[in-house]
Interface confidence: low
């Protein structure tokens, strides 16, 4: 991009941070007007996120990025998500010491929660590499949500669409088995932790995307905010992911893609995360940021204060 | 899902000794595999981990040196145990930690002569 | 090695009482604290992981608090069922490489 468009481009989005009230969290709407003008999202973003249309089944208006950085990491609209917007420094300050207060919230919604089991049973299905019946998925959800089965098969594809890049196939238009296409081009992501098996390495990315939209340091209420709507639990061993706090706190902090942190001076002690060393060589804000817009069906514009200081990160490193 | 250890029994003193782990209805690939094991009236000493991620073991410092643990598939952990004394007699347990824990019931090994 | 040290070694109370068991650790441990419940001739049950969120199917009679050196078990409304030797156990931090997966010595609750 020329140097004059850049500044241009970088005093627009100063002026929309201006308005932006709570930092990351509560994303403006870009409006169809605003988004004529914004050349970042037609030319400037390599890896085609800006041509992506939005994912089926998710109801976004045009360019909104959901409210809280779980459900922009996660791919839900904003409607789904379960906080609102909060104060960034508010949030962080009323963290609790553990990540219980947030897991396993009993007021959620059965539904999410029947679409989180789904999801993990269709990614265990997937791991095993077998084709999976209607049947089976109805067993999964029950006599009790049956009728609501339509709904919950609807959240759970789009679960594993957008943060796996799985779809799921019906084998012919009446039958009832259905078998996975595996849509997203691996490439951008061989690097990150290519020694994993699929589906663990592909909550890398999202979870990234949660610490930086939470302004580079997230808490275990964040992450568990995220991985609650995945239907990963805390406490509650999963099918694919195995025990997710060892994952999260253990595997991905030893690789050294994550840090995890006892925020200084805080008692009792609360435990933040952070970006590891290997995230910042294998990856960048910008890719994570991209990634971060193809699953919500939207640009890196619609957040426009991470674009900002991607961008910045990317003329740091001299990209 | 369960956990079931094997390989106890007698042994004589400064004998050797191979316990084995073996998972039911999963794989032990996400896990910390441990060996714990408690004297007959006594309380709960570990002994020692792997994690089956990455392949890393530790160890208690007594451990060290007489206790090796070895994942052997994607189901089984054994634990090589040599120079045993009769104060190594116990029911050895496997656990799948940390915060989703398993045990299997246990092995009973005696070290007499 | 981390030390845990458990007191009492034993405890008595009625039926309906509260217990209290206290956990402290050589070395600030943070919340990276498990209770465990063993009866006669089975393995340890998992009561309280992580110093305070109980276990799946665990009542919240049980409560679990502390951090750093410092942790707590109380049982409350004390059943019958609760007779038991119960145990905390350290496992290590992840900030470091230092693995400590230990055990306090236990306490014997009987409930009369």
């Known amino acids: 991009m020329p140097r004059g468009q850049k500044s241009k481009l970088r005093a627009r989005e100063k002026r929309r941070k201006a308005r932006d009230e709570t930092r990351g969290l509560n994303v403006p709407q870009v409006t169809e007007a605003e988004e004529e003008e914004a050349p970042c999202c037609s030319s400037s973003v390599s890896g085609g996120a800006a041509s992506s249309s939005p994912a089926a089944g998710i109801p976004q208006e045009p360019q909104r990025a959901p409210t809280t950085a779980a459900a922009a990491a996660a791919g839900v609209s904003s409607t789904k998500s379960k906080k609102g917007a909060k104060s960034h420094q508010g949030e962080k300050n009323a963290s609790s010491s553990q990540a219980s207060t947030s897991t396993k919230s009993p007021s959620e919604d059965p539904l999410t929660r029947k679409s989180g089991s789904l999801v993990q049973f269709l990614l265990y299905k997937y791991k095993i590499k077998k084709s999976v019946t209607k049947g089976e998925m109805l067993k999964i959800v029950g006599k009790r949500f049956r009728e609501h089965f339509p709904e919950i098969l609807k959240k759970a594809s789009e679960g594993l669409s957008v943060v796996f890049g799985l779809e799921l196939n019906k084998v012919n238009p009446n039958g009832h088995t259905y078998t996975f296409i595996d849509k997203v081009d691996l490439t951008d992501e061989e690097s990150l932790l290519s020694s994993w098996d699929f589906p663990r390495r592909k909550l890398l990315m999202p979870l990234l995307g949660v610490i930086f939209l939470n302004g580079n340091s997230a808490t275990e209420e964040e992450i568990w905010e995220f991985l609650n709507m995945l239907g990963v639990y805390d406490g509650e061993e999963h099918s694919v992911f195995g025990e997710p706090w060892k994952l999260i706190t253990k595997d991905l902090v030893q690789e050294k893609y994550l840090e995890y942190k006892q925020v200084p001076s805080s008692d009792p002690p609360r435990f933040q995360f952070l970006w590891g060393p290997r995230a910042y060589a294998e990856t960048s804000k910008m890719k994570v940021l991209e990634f971060l817009a193809k699953v919500n069906g939207t640009t890196p514009c619609a957040f426009p204060t991470h674009y900002e200081e991607a961008l910045k990160d990317e003329e740091k490193a001299g990209v | 899902q369960s956990l079931e250890e094997s390989g106890g029994g007698l042994v004589q003193p400064e004998g050797s000794l191979t316990l084995t782990c073996t998972a039911s209805g999963f794989t032990l690939n996400n896990y910390y595999i441990c060996w714990v094991r408690q004297a007959p009236g006594k309380g709960l000493e570990w002994i020692a981990c792997?994690?089956?991620?990455?392949?890393?073991t530790y160890y208690a410092s007594w451990a060290k040196g007489r206790f090796t643990i070895s994942r052997t598939s994607s189901t089984t952990v054994t634990l090589q145990m040599t120079s045993l004394t009769a104060a190594d007699t116990a029911t050895y347990f496997c656990?799948?930690?940390?915060?989703?824990?398993?045990w299997g019931p246990g092995t009973l090994v005696t070290v007499s002569s | 090695d981390i030390v845990m040290t458990q007191t009492p070694f034993s405890v008595e109370a009625a039926v309906g009482g509260t217990v209290t068991i206290k956990c402290q650790a050589s070395?600030?441990?943070?919340?990276?604290l498990s209770w465990y419940q063993q009866k006669p001739g089975q393995p340890p049950k998992l009561l309280i992981y992580?110093?305070?969120p109980l276990a799946s199917g665990v009542p919240s009679r049980f409560k679990g608090s502390g951090s750093g050196t410092q942790f707590t078990l109380t049982i409350s409304d004390l059943e019958c069922a609760d007779a038991a030797t119960y145990y905390c156990?350290?496992?290590?931090?992840?900030?470091?490489?230092?693995?400590?997966?230990?055990f306090g010595g236990g306490t014997e609750v009987v409930v009369r």
């Open positions: 156990q350290s496992y290590d931090d992840s900030s470091s490489n230092n693995f400590f997966y230990g």
């Open positions: 992580r110093a305070s």
């Open positions: 656990a799948r930690s940390l915060s989703t824990p398993l």
């Open positions: 792997i994690d089956n991620v990455n392949g890393r």
């Open positions: 070395q600030s441990i943070s919340s990276y």
